[in-house]
């Protein structure tokens, strides 16, 4: 058993049928010695008396808010949560496996630049009685500071019969140098509590591996005289690290017909302009990627050919 | 330790071309190592990220763009020895800063070259003959060093008398390649920045 926060405790259980569970001793936070009784949640049934209460915690019916009283007055509370270990592996019931970029990916994180700011998000089908808290650091043995905000519900989607909820959090490394070569990964830890179930999820990454630039901005077409060709131009996104001559991007320009089956013409360039043939009803899209370290491509920025 | 005397090439930028070749070569070599050594811990998540140049060179700091010198997190342990975006080698200070940066890059390349050659000699003794260093990568390191045009004492190749532990050697190869790829990215960024200056 360990303390998650004041008056909230997590009991770790080897979870299998007929398991013996864990013996837990609760102590009433009071100078009083006599006349103390204990109850669980809203029930008025007295579970025991005395300054300490010994219970055998086996399943969720044994978890909850234990309260000690004296003469009708509440003295203190202890909330017991359960953390299930199933065959040597901690349960992952609360969050959905996003399966991207690989199986067992519960937390996904992205950064728009090298400033040390990043966003993580996760999915669940649970809509109520759910709380998250997020901590982060650079490295784990001698951790350096990363500050995270509160996790917020950022999207709701319908997936088949189920509703899916996306939560996200923003974090910022306290003293980040955009040009630094990372040798210690960022660690992100999410505590999830659903009713009386506790779970924790972690992700470890280098900022360089989670970079995903914003799409190029100010995408424009300039027709070339006496030609079906157009000059496409764009600019670096505002959120990208500067100076751009140091943090350079490379671009992919795509001409896509109305039908998805039509052949796509693609051009790769390090410049912020390109000359392409604009077909009728086609659209031109441009996306960006770090020129020197191949992390994710940005989303496409698009304009119609006409 | 005395820094080598700099004679930077005024038309900087064969260096840009060579640094791009270097990044391509080390990335290919790393990809090959990850595929060939699939049963070894060779992914970024599994290896310890060690930097053989730590405390010996200071490439990131010495080559910091002027715009980032206002960022205190980038200046944690040094005087403002940064490269400038002023006209190429316009002043003596600029020239000195750039020389410091380029000599630091040169020292990096020299250290990695020695490590890779020593390692290749060990890998050639492996009865499994599982993996060797790409000669193209070694050649590209050499070309960039020549383009940087520094004169520096040659470091003798380390020789080891004991029987090599091939498992450890292959894991060390992965560690070196990961670190060298990161340094090659920095070198490419620096050359691109200097080219634009």
């Amino acid at each position: 058993i360990w303390e998650l926060k004041k008056d909230v405790y997590v009991v770790e259980l080897d979870w299998y049928p007929d398991a013996p569970g864990e013996m837990v001793v609760l102590t009433c936070d009071t100078p009083e010695e006599d006349g103390i009784t204990w109850t669980l949640d809203q029930s008025s049934e007295v579970l025991g008396s005395g300054k300490t209460l010994t219970i055998q915690v086996k399943e969720f019916g044994d978890a909850g808010q234990y309260t000690c009283h004296k003469g009708g007055e509440v003295l203190s509370h202890s909330l017991l949560l359960l953390h299930k270990k199933e065959d040597g592996i901690w349960s992952t019931d609360i969050l959905k496996d996003q399966k991207e970029p690989k199986n067992k990916t519960f937390l996904r994180c992205e950064a728009k630049n090298y400033s040390g700011r990043f966003t993580c998000w996760w999915l669940t089908t649970i809509s109520t009685d759910l709380t998250f808290s997020v901590k982060s650091s650079r490295g784990s043995s001698d951790p350096q500071g990363v500050t995270c905000g509160a996790a917020t519900l950022s999207a709701e989607r319908v997936r088949g019969d189920n509703k899916e909820y996306e939560y996200s959090v923003e974090c910022q490394e306290d003293s980040a140098c955009p040009a630094a070569e990372e040798s210690l990964p960022i660690e992100v830890m999410v505590d999830a509590v659903h009713k009386l179930k506790y779970e924790n999820y972690t992700s470890s990454f280098f900022i360089r591996d989670i970079i995903k630039p914003d799409p190029p901005k100010n995408l424009q077409l300039k027709p070339l005289k006496n030609s079906r060709q157009v000059e496409v131009s764009w600019e670096y996104p505002d959120t990208w690290s500067t100076p751009h001559s140091y943090f350079s991007l490379t671009f992919c320009v795509q001409v896509q017909g109305k039908s998805k089956r039509e052949k796509k013409d693609r051009v790769f360039t390090d410049k912020t302009s390109a000359t392409v043939i604009c077909r009728k009803n086609a659209s031109i899209s441009v996306r960006a990627q770090d020129r020197y370290y191949s992390s994710s491509w940005s989303e496409w920025a698009s304009v119609p050919c006409s | 330790r005395n820094l080598p005397v700099a004679t930077p090439d005024p038309g900087m930028f064969p260096c840009l071309h060579h640094s791009q070749n270097l990044l391509r070569a080390v990335s290919n070599m790393l990809q090959k190592a990850r595929q060939t050594l699939e049963f070894y811990p060779c992914t970024s998540e599994e290896i310890d990220h060690e930097d053989i140049t730590k405390d010996k060179t200071s490439t990131v700091e010495a080559c910091l763009p002027l715009e980032l010198t206002k960022n205190e997190s980038c200046l944690n342990s040094r005087e403002t020895s940064f490269i400038t975006n002023g006209s190429c080698l316009a002043s003596r200070k600029t020239s000195f800063m750039m020389a410091l940066c380029l000599s630091s890059i040169y020292e990096d390349l020299k250290m990695y070259q020695v490590e890779f050659k020593t390692m290749n000699a060990k890998l050639l003794m492996d009865p499994k003959r599982q993996i060797f260093l790409d000669q193209n990568m070694l050649a590209v390191i050499d070309e960039l060093m020549q383009a940087l045009n520094f004169n520096s004492e040659t470091v003798p190749q380390k020789s080891s008398l004991e029987e090599p532990d091939f498992y450890k050697t292959k894991i060390k190869l992965c560690i070196l390649l990961h670190a060298f790829r990161i340094r090659a990215v920095t070198i490419d960024r620096v050359m691109s920045y200097l080219n634009a200056s």
């Epitope: 299998y16 199933e86 592996i89 | -």
Partner: antibody, heavy 115, light 112 residues
Framework: QVQLVQSGGGVVQPGRSLRLSCAAS????????MHWVRQAPGKGLEWVAF????????YYADSVKGRFTISRDNSKNTLYLQMKSLRAEDTAVYYC????????WGQGTMVTVSS | SYVLTQPPSVSGTPGQRVTISCSGG????????VKWYQQLPGTAPKLLIY???QRPSGVPDRFSGSKSGTSASLAITGVQAEDEADYYC????????????FGTGTKVTVLG
């Protein structure tokens, strides 16, 4: 004590269907994940499928994906394996088992796919 | 296809020490615990070892388990005639959990 009693095995022709059941008692069935494991005659153990305690997630071996469906009825304390498009290579003893460090197995039920 | 490899058979005379190996990889045995089962002819498997080296109550202490790196082993010290059975190791893979990974199985024969 924990008990898992299996039923539903038998002889079936290729291409036909069969449903296996596993009735649980002696524990809170709705709190635990469950597996199906099979063993072809003279061969080793092969995992078939898993279902979470609440039925929300199901996992299958590639060899049965799209043909077999694992399900549970927590109100009846029963686990099921619906097997469709059966093949000769599905011939095996099928076991249900609880998920956890200490597990309990059903007695096994024989499924023979033969024309 | 089996990812955990065991020797097809091992044998020993009563009282001898018999060991069975189970070889896997970094993503299974290398990072997840191992179980061992005993299966007597015509019966369901019986748990012998969980958590690499833990014995459930009722399992004789002549059975012991261990793990090192990407391999695990089961030792029977002072093998007895009633130990003649098939033995299976079991683990999970980090990427496919909760799918069970079973070893290829080892037939233990007690001679004499």
């Amino acid at each position: 004590q924990v008990q898992l009693v299996q039923s539903g095995g038998g002889v079936v022709q290729p291409g036909r269907s069969l449903r296996l059941s596993c009735a649980a008692s002696g524990f809170t069935f709705s709190s635990y994940g469950m597996h199906w494991v099979r063993q072809a005659p003279g061969k080793g153990l092969e995992w078939v499928a898993f279902i979470r305690y609440d039925g929300s997630n199901k996992y299958y071996a590639d060899s049965v994906k799209g043909r077999f469906t694992i399900s549970r009825d927590n109100s009846k304390n029963t686990l099921y394996l619906q097997m469709k498009s059966l093949r000769a290579e599905d011939t095996a003893v099928y076991y249900c088992k609880t998920h956890g460090s200490h597990d309990n197995w059903g007695q096994g039920t024989m499924v023979t796919v033969s024309s | 296809s089996y990812v955990l490899t065991q020797p097809p058979s091992v044998s020993g005379t009563p009282g001898q020490r018999v060991t069975i190996s189970c070889s896997g990889g970094r993503s299974n045995i290398g990072s997840i615990t191992v179980k061992w089962y005993q299966q007597l002819p015509g019966t369901a498997p019986k748990l012998l070892i969980y958590g690499n080296d833990q014995r459930p109550s009722g399992v004789p202490d002549r059975f012991s388990g261990s793990k090192s790196g990407t391999s695990a082993s089961l030792a029977i010290t002072g093998v007895q005639a009633e130990d003649e059975a098939d033995y299976y190791c079991q683990s999970y893979d980090r990427g496919t959990h909760p799918a069970l990974l079973f070893g290829t199985g080892t037939k233990v024969t007690v001679l004499g």
